[in-house]
């Protein structure tokens, strides 16, 4: 059987000879060289060599436990002549013994950490860790103790854990933000002769809201022209806050002052400034100066710092409204006038009024914008704003006239304003009614008396308030002895009726009937229209079969015997 124990070897051997490990030996070995010892496994033939005759093992190189703490090899004892193993192949271990040849090494060369300013003493900042490659199971070579070399009295380190904590009360970021702490890790439990390593911990105090906003001045003054439209920025105010980020965010508000309704303040998120803007239209002539009380406050407040006072500040803002030369202002936004269409030239329709709103009350002159009255139908008195006609009107040509009137300051012609003028032309009965169409009808030779042969319709260009009322009659010159009669239907229509039984187209082929149409308005307007009636041969149903090609028309426009 094999005769050996576990082999132990001290690391980092520095002798000149090979380091002796131990002897492999079989009790079958008679010492006559008949056995051959063979080594295989970790490092065999390279790190470890064996005398094949004696079984002596040596290490050829300096071994580092931290690189490999244990080598597992296999041993064979073989009859040199036959190759027959005299022992079963066996595994054995070479264990490398530790020496303190490694200093603690921090997992990072430089640590970065943050801790809120004003933290309580003992607040956790960061944990640093150093590892020692030496054997933790043997001696104190790998027992690490932490200490602080730089960074007191601000920070401390727990010797066992490497936990860094705050050590000073009320560390204020606004006073100092960055700290460089140097931590040492020493092995051998920190005793003399131990190896050490260091690391740097860069600690940044993070901001907390421990500072209120402060206006650098108590009063601000801005000027703005009265013409500034709502939304116009007037000026910027800025409160400063020693904090950073959201702790330095400021909200501005107007809390008091007679300008409370007239102005707004908005917060510029980029610059953290308060922008004073116009809220309503200003009028220098009404009020020349406003005062506001503006407040700057932190939207996010930490309750534990409320004992330091309110996290807001206020300032007075004085706003001076500047006078602006304003154009004249008409008394109305638009004027609607009306005039009869029969008005004579120079008839006054109405008037417009404009005033300079400025304190100076500059005089105003009026004019018509000729682009809106190319035909120069209307004119205006430049002094008093009276509108009058300069041409005759016709409602039936144009019902509405839309013109623009300009008011201009006499002393400053650049200051002008415009107003629309809508002029309605009122109707006058100045048009006679007339036939709606040209009437040409026929009568059958065998027609009976009082037979309706045509219905008449009339039209009138006028537009009377109570509607049209037309009356129809035969012209006086044709009324006696007429072959036809006119029947007024009292509904703005009339019928032509036969007055006798039978007509002879060979005797009279065409009749011309002069019809008078009158309206019922004042002054009464009437006109005479002629209806042509042809005599035709008809079938027994009364359908026309043949007529003479044309009627005999007298120069008077009336037929004989109509």
């Amino acid at each position: 059987s094999w005769m050996w124990n576990q082999f132990f070897l001290l690391e980092e051997y520095t002798g000149s000879d090979y380091q002796y490990v131990g002897k492999l030996h079989s009790d079958q070995d008679r010492g006559d060289g008949s056995l051959k010892y063979i080594l295989s496994g970790d490092g065999a033939g390279d790190l470890f060599i064996i005398n094949e005759n004696t079984g002596d093992i040596q290490a050829t190189k300096r071994l580092d436990r931290e690189e490999k703490p244990v080598y597992i090899l296999r041993a064979q004892a073989i009859n040199r002549r036959t190759g027959r193993p005299v022992e079963p192949e066996s595994e054995f271990i070479i264990k490398i013994h530790d020496i303190n040849d490694n200093e603690p090494i921090f997992t990072k060369e430089v640590y970065t950490a943050t801790v809120p300013e004003m933290s309580d003493v003992g607040t956790f900042v960061v944990q640093v860790t150093a590892t020692d490659a030496d054997d933790p199971t043997y001696g104190n070579s790998a027992k690490v103790v932490y200490s602080i070399l730089q960074g007191q009295p601000y920070f401390s380190v727990e010797s066992e854990t490497g936990i860094i904590k705050t050590a000073l009360l009320n560390m204020d970021r606004e006073n100092r933000e960055q700290y460089q702490v140097v931590i040492q890790a020493k092995d051998m439990g920190g005793q003399m002769g131990g190896l050490s390593g260091t690391t740097t911990v860069n600690i940044t105090l993070t901001d907390v809201n421990d500072n209120p906003p402060r206006f650098p001045q108590s009063t601000y003054q801005f000027k703005t022209p009265e013409s500034s439209p709502p939304g116009t920025p007037i000026g910027r105010i800025k409160a400063s806050d020693a904090d950073v980020g959201e702790n330095a965010e400021i909200e501005y508000s107007i809390t008091d002052g007679e300008g409370l309704d007239m102005f707004d303040v908005i917060t510029d998120q980029e610059t953290q400034e308060g922008i004073i803007t116009v809220k309503k239209l200003l009028d220098f002539e009404k009020k020349k100066v406003y005062t506001l009380k503006v407040e700057a406050s932190n939207p996010y407040v930490e309750p534990r710092f409320l004992y330091l006072g309110p996290f807001k500040d206020s300032a007075t803002v004085r706003i001076v409204v500047e006078d602006v030369d304003e154009p004249p202002v008409f008394s109305k936004l638009a004027y609607i006038l009306q005039i009869r269409e029969d008005a004579q030239i120079n008839t006054t329709i109405g008037s417009v009024t404009a005033q300079d709103p400025d304190a100076a009350r500059n005089p105003v002159k009026y004019s018509v914008d000729r682009h809106t009255d190319m035909d120069r139908i209307f004119n205006i008195d430049s002094g008093n704003g009276s509108i009058f006609t300069s041409k005759l009107l016709d409602r039936e040509t144009l019902l509405w006239h839309n013109i623009t009137v300009i008011a201009t300051e006499i002393n400053n012609p650049k200051q002008s304003s415009r107003v629309p003028l809508y002029i309605k032309v009122l109707d006058v009965n100045d048009n006679a009614p007339e036939f709606a169409e040209f009437y040409e009808t026929f009568v059958c030779e065998k027609a009976k008396a009082d037979q309706l042969i045509q219905t008449l319709h009339a039209v009138d260009k006028d537009d009377p308030y109570s509607g049209h009322q037309f009356s129809f009659s035969l012209a006086p010159e044709a009324a006696s002895g007429s072959n036809f009669t006119i029947q007024d239907n009292k509904d703005n229509t009339a019928g032509i009726l036969t007055r006798k039984n039978g007509y002879n187209r060979h005797e009279m082929s065409t009749y011309l009937l002069p019809v008078v149409i009158s309206d019922n308005d004042y002054p009464v307007q009437s006109s005479t229209g002629t209806v042509t009636v042809r005599v035709c041969a008809c079938d027994h149903h009364g359908n026309m079969q043949s007529c003479h090609a044309e009627a005999l028309i007298h120069p008077t426009g009336l037929s004989t015997g109509a």
Epitope: G33, N79, R80, R81, T82, G83, R84, P85, P88
Partner: antibody, heavy 117, light 111 residues
Amino acid sequence: QVQLQQPGAELVKPGTSVKMSCKASGYTFTSDWIAWVKQRPGQGLEWIGDIYPGSGRTHNNEKFNFKATLTVDTSSNTAYMQLSSLTSEDSAVYFCARPMLGRFDYWGQGTTLTVSS
Amino acid sequence: DIVLTQSPASLAVSLGQRATISCRASESVSIHGTHLMHWYQQKPGQPPKLLIYAASNLESGVPARFSGSGSETDFTLNIHPVEEEDAATYFCQQSFEDPFTFGSGTKLEIK
């Protein structure tokens, strides 16, 4: 490189004896065994025995106990095998070889022994 | 003595094919995981040449087409693919106990 040199042939009369040689080179002669193997024409191989030059210790095939005697001369790195009372049955090729862990990794070219009157 | 029986006594194999030679020992030649069986090639007029040692280990300089396997009493030599130069007689040998013995040989012929 390892070499084992043997004379090519020996011609002897029946009833006599012969001592054939095997000169080793290329390795430490005293550290390894030398074996002898017989091969009759068209026949198989027979292990005769071996000797450890470092100590002169031998192992013999009992079949050749009274036929073969193995010796060495360490000064000349030569191994010898003497065959006695020769008969025609001893006519064969005789190889010397190096047994390394039971296997013959190097062989001589062989000496052809002819026993004839 | 341990008797080694080789089979077949001779075989003819086509070029590129596999040749398989068997060697059976009269008793086990294995101990502690070591199999003390070795294989040799011999060509006419030459000494034997070691091919495989300890049943399956290829001797340095021997082509990889030669391989060995087996344990206890049954061992095999395989040649694949067979080449022209492989025509020879093949012997097995045990070193488990004295006397060392050889098989009777197998003659390989290439078709």
